[in-house]
């Protein structure tokens, strides 16, 4: 669960009656104002381990749309445009928090949920196991 | 904001008094049970665009610990272990949701916040701008 800091001006978190359910303000504060707007925009195509982005939509979840990366190749792309199977394209995955409507369809009640998403791909040296 | 589905068994979301603040159950449901446990574990070291993971801690945020990737090189690592500066290591970034305590230090009141995190690095062909 969430580690709760102690503060005399707040309810005691050890209290048996302390809510497992908290209030969350949905006016999202975006901290990304100073970031490069291009970000990873075209990396998916320029990478030696390029990927496609698949739209995963679920109206019962916030955010309702999540983009999942799928590596295009098992190998990595060389400078000449050919696939090199001595290297492997692999997805970089990250666990993210989403809000899941609970009960279903209700707009003002949610449960925190952790899901694993593939964000992009990277090119790695394979671990080679030879037959004795 | 969050797109609200209509459901006759729930409060009307168009109501002026409809809360901007919702209830969120903090018992996190983890959907990642069937995923490959290896995941991205050692990719940061085996990648041609390797990265280091930096711990970003903030007790006023959930999750309080977020790992940020920083690419080790400007170029990409070749098979012989040397860095190739004709290619670029770049961070793959993703916008994620976190919960920010609001008011500060209070355990049962939060605001949704979007932050941009670097998840790992990938090797890309640089965009070359030639001088006319």
């Amino acid at each position: 669960g969430i580690a709760i800091p102690r503060n005399s001006g707040c309810p005691n978190s050890e209290d048996k009656n302390f809510p497992r359910t908290v209030m969350v303000n949905l006016n999202i504060h975006n901290r990304n104002t100073s970031t490069n707007p291009k970000r990873s925009s075209d990396y998916y195509n320029r990478s030696t381990s390029p990927w496609n982005l698949h739209r995963n939509e679920d109206p019962e979840r916030y955010p309702s749309v999540i983009w999942e990366a799928k590596c295009r190749h098992l190998g990595c792309v060389k400078a000449d445009g050919n696939v090199d199977y001595h290297m492997n394209s692999v997805p970089i995955q990250q666990e993210i928090l989403v809000l899941r409507r609970e009960p279903r369809h209700c707009p003002n009640s949610f449960r925190l949920e952790k899901i694993l998403v593939s964000v992009g791909c990277t090119c790695v040296t394979p671990i080679v196991h030879h037959v004795a | 904001g969050i797109a609200i589905p209509r459901n006759s068994g729930c409060p009307n979301s168009e109501d002026k008094n409809f809360p901007r603040t919702v209830m969120v159950n903090l018992n996190i449901h983890n959907r990642n049970t069937s995923t490959n446990p290896k995941r991205s574990s050692d990719y940061y070291n085996r990648s041609t665009s390797p990265w280091n993971l930096h711990r970003n801690e903030d007790p006023e945020r959930y999750p309080s610990v977020i790992w940020e990737a920083k690419c080790r090189h400007l170029g990409c690592v070749k098979a012989d272990g040397n860095v190739d500066y004709h290619m670029n290591s770049v961070p793959i970034q993703q916008e994620i949701l976190v919960l920010r305590r609001e008011p500060r230090h209070c355990p049962n009141s939060f605001r949704l916040e979007k932050i941009l995190v670097s998840v790992g690095c990938t090797c890309v062909t640089p965009i070359v701008h030639h001088v006319a």
Epitope: Y85, N88 | K38
Partner: antibody
Framework: QVQVQESGPGLVKPSETLSLTCTVS?????????WNWIRQPPGKGLEWMGY???????SYNPSLKSRITISVDTSKNQFSLKLSSVTAADTAVYYC?????????????WGQGTLVTVSS | IIVMTQSPLSLPVTLGQPASISCRSS???????????LHWYQQRPGQSPRLLIY???NRFSGVPDRFSGSGSGTDFTLKISRVEAEDVGVYFC????????FGQGTRLEIK
């Protein structure tokens, strides 16, 4: 139903270039597939020659790399094989085939094959 | 290049009896993403090959459930629980984890 169909000359002279075309129907050549050439010398096993993917990336069998070119013509929904400097060892049934290139990475549809004989 | 070695090269089987074909690779076929890209194909006499099993044990659509695949790493097996007359032909294992390669083929015939 997906269909792939090879076409091209059945006889090629030694040292010349073998050229084959594969026409794809029932499937856009630009969707998530790789388009392969695989050959089978008479009475022998299968040899993977190479492929071109929906994104235009190619991969070739290292043993043929200096002689092989695979290209795609999206307007005609076709892909082609060129194999230069052929010898009698290149006599085989040549198959074009579709590889599911998004998850399983296996060839799921094959053409019926065309026999190419290298002889003077 | 990965060498795929099949055994036996010839397999005479009585109708209704089981059959088993082994395939061994010279290197592990486990990709860095955790998947194993080992496939089985059937080539009936005078026909093109046809996909039977993909990624070790998954039956391709339309393939009867008497065909099954198993194995891991470098050792893989194709089993036919009860051989039927239409199963006669050559069976190839293939890998696409590395540069794609095929086994030399196993000829299944009826005794």
């Amino acid at each position: 139903q997906v269909q792939v169909q090879e076409s091209g000359p059945g006889l090629v002279k030694p040292s010349e270039t073998l050229s084959l075309t594969c026409t794809v129907s029932g499937n856009s050549i630009t969707s998530y597939y790789a388009w392969n050439w695989i050959r089978q010398p008479p009475g022998k096993g299968l040899e993977w020659m190479g492929y071109i993917t929906y994104s235009g990336t190619t991969s070739y069998n290292p043993s043929l790399k200096s002689r092989i070119t695979i290209s795609v013509d999206t307007s005609k929904n076709q892909f082609s094989l060129k194999l230069s400097s052929v010898t009698a060892a290149d006599t085989a049934v040549y198959y074009c085939a579709r590889e599911e290139y998004d998850d399983i990475y296996a060839v799921d549809y094959w053409g019926q094959g065309t026999l190419v004989t290298v002889s003077s | 290049i990965i060498v795929m070695t099949q055994s036996p090269l010839s397999l005479p089987v009585t109708l209704g009896q089981p059959a088993s074909i082994s395939c061994r690779s010279s290197q592990s076929l486990v990709h860095s993403n955790g998947n194993t890209y080992l496939h089985w194909y059937q080539q009936r006499p005078g026909q093109s090959p046809r996909l039977l099993i993909y990624k070790v044990y998954n039956r391709f659509s339309g393939v009867p459930d008497r065909f099954s695949g198993s194995g891991s790493g470098t050792d893989f097996t194709l089993k036919i629980s009860r051989v039927e007359a239409e199963d006669v032909g050559v069976y190839f294992c293939s890998q696409s984890t590395h540069f794609p390669t095929f086994g030399q083929g196993t000829r299944l015939e009826i005794k």
